[in-house]
């Protein structure tokens, strides 16, 4: 039968300068002798002879005298090749060809690697730096193989991908020197890290530089608002919080504060030229003038209406600017439901009745749930309608049609999904014949 040759499926990884073993084995048949063996190692692509064993003898290295077999192990089927003092130029595929009577061959890949040095960092210019200045940071790492992957990140670990130029040059041994240049506009201060990764060794070499420039006369404005919607009851006052961090020496004359509706851009309230310009929104808004100088740009909205619901943008500019949107969620609690029954007298088990549950002046639209006396949900034959009045508040009417049992309790729960407020009503129908409401 055909001869089967085993080699590793994955590349053999060898560090430059070390020795590598390219494993290859075959299964000798009983009675096998080395006189029968013809073993050839050659470069897969060029077919250049590397090492051979023939006519019962090791024919030696044909590859810069840096290869050897394992003669004591050949008879057991170990045809591996030892490659000494690995060089970058050795990288590639080697074929192990074995013939006895039949023959077989397989190729094994040699992947050469060399670790990169710890990067050195340089800065240009390297003095009198101010926020807003453009600086060039160079990260250099030497004598690695194969080509590196270079990553830049800021102090928070966020990748910096723009304005990066990386060059890799191979020396006469084929090892790479990496130079990566990052051009950045300085913030108030910052740490810049360079990571040089050897993709084969999965080895990372890091360095970082922290730049604390002199304080600049300008800095980006960062506006803080609540992430969750502000929930306000209809008719009450709501505060839409917004704040910024004033720099030392900040004066209100420098402040330009604008509140506007996010979607329509309609002006709500503004503070410019050192003065509160007042409400442009039905005269129901106010700032907190005594707190503005400390960075409190919050807006007070009075007598909240359903129509106020939505997103408000707080825009702050001093020299630079920033903005963020805060959502206002309006709510109104639902009234305790009133229950009516139709027909409401001479009721007997088996009769179909219509129970109506009504709850008024809530917002937003309600969720309505029906259940029986045991708390089991009743979902069939329920019709719910919700109508908004001129203020935008909803009246809810939910109708349940049921066939009466011997007796029963039917409960209606009206839930306000924003306030998580539940309003309950229930009716108990007992005895026969029955009348509703029960007569005194």
């Amino acid at each position: 039968g055909a001869l089967e040759v085993q080699v590793p499926e994955d590349p053999v990884v060898a560090l430059v300068g070390t020795d590598a073993t390219l494993c290859c084995s075959f299964s000798p048949e009983p009675g096998f002798s080395l006189a029968q063996l013809n073993l050839i190692w050659q470069l897969t692509d060029t077919k250049q002879l590397v090492h051979s064993f023939a006519e019962g003898q090791d024919q030696g290295s044909a590859y810069a005298n840096r290869t050897a077999l394992f003669p004591d192990l050949l008879a057991q089927g170990n045809a591996s090749l030892r490659l000494q003092r690995v060089r970058v130029a050795d990288e590639g595929s080697f074929t192990c060809f074995v013939s006895i009577r039949d023959f077989g061959s397989a190729a094994v890949s040699l992947q050469v690697a060399a670790p990169y040095s710890k990067p050195s960092m340089t800065l240009e210019p390297n003095k009198d730096l101010r926020p807003g200045d453009t600086v060039t940071i160079t990260c250099s790492s030497y004598q690695g193989y194969p080509e590196a992957e270079v990553f830049w990140q800021d102090g928070q670990g966020v990748p910096l991908t723009g304005n990066v130029t990386t060059s890799q040059m191979a020396n006469e041994q084929g090892l790479f020197d990496v130079h990566s240049i990052l051009r950045v506009v300085l913030g108030a201060n910052g740490t810049y890290s360079c990571l040089v990764r050897n993709p084969v060794l999965q080895q990372d070499a890091h360095s970082s530089v922290t730049i604390t420039p002199q304080r600049s006369p300008t800095g980006a404005v960062e506006v803080q608002v609540p992430e969750d919607p502000v929930v306000a009851l209809v008719g009450t006052d709501a505060t839409l919080r917004c704040s910024f961090s004033p720099e030392p020496g900040f004066s209100l004359a420098q402040l330009n504060l604008i509140w506007q509706l996010t979607d329509t851009k309609q002006l709500v309230h503004s503070f410019t030229e050192g003065r509160d310009q007042g409400s442009a929104y039905a005269n129901r808004t106010a700032l907190f003038p005594d707190l503005l100088a400390q960075g409190n740009a919050s807006l007070r909205l009075q007598r909240v209406r359903v129509a106020d619901e939505g997103s408000f943008t707080c825009f702050v500019s001093i020299r630079d600017f920033g903005s963020a949107a805060v959502s206002l969620q309006v709510a109104a609690p639902y009234s305790k439901p009133s229950m009516t029954l139709e027909p409401n007298k001479d009721l007997r088990p088996g009769d179909t009745v219509t129970i109506t549950c009504s709850s008024y002046r809530g917002y937003p639209e309600a969720e309505v749930f029906w259940q029986d006396g045991q708390g089991v949900p009743l979902t069939g034959n329920v019709t719910t309608s919700q109508m908004a009045n001129e203020q935008g508040l909803f009246d809810v009417h939910s109708v349940l049609r049921v066939v009466l049992g011997a007796n029963g309790t039917y409960s209606c729960l009206v839930r306000n999904p924003v306030l998580q407020q539940d309003a309950h009503g229930s009716v108990t129908i007992t005895g026969q014949p029955m009348t509703f409401p029960p007569e005194a």
Partner: antibody, heavy 119, light 106 residues
Amino acid sequence: QVQLVQSGAEVKKPGASVKVSCKVSGFSLTSYHVSWVRQAPGQGLEWMGAISSGGSSYYNSKFQGRVTMTRDTSTSTVYMELSSLRSEDTAVYFCTGDLGAAISWFAYWGQGTLVTVSS
Amino acid sequence: DIQMTQSPSSLSASVGDRVTITCRTSQSIYKSLAWYQQKPGKAPKLLIYNAHSLQTGIPSRFSGSGSGTDFTLTISSLQPEDFATYFCQQYYSGLTFGSGTKLEIK
């Protein structure tokens, strides 16, 4: 409807200045903010600066000292002047804006003006 | 400055595919983020503002989500006219654009 129409392409030598205009119609400059955004060939978008509806100017610190943005409300025109030009300033320059006093996103864009800087 | 990291830088997809593009910022920007579409030789076009609000006239197959530092633009079912470059933009602190994602036909 809202329109922003920009001046034509320019070829400049390094060290020179260029002034690009953007004439707006369909809205008043006193109710819209206008920004300038540039795009080098095959590259991304870079915000250069803005004029708010109230007339305040804001500049990207990268261009501070080299860029000036002005407006003429009587002719509804906004101007962007970039000085000390270098080859890396070769780009398409867009004027862009939106309603409101708060500078934020841009619903309206000009057609772009190609500025080529070459010796 | 707030750094914007947009990924992937390029993407191949077919008509009808669902496509997601992400934008990550170096610090929280709440929902102060917009998305644009740009076709060669044309000005960008606003798709989404405030992270998830659809601009008037934009088809509903475009949607935006996210808040804080991680944002996503989703095209639910790619149409031939959607092959273009997409940019994110923050307006929380100053203005910055992402580096762009080129959406190509597979």
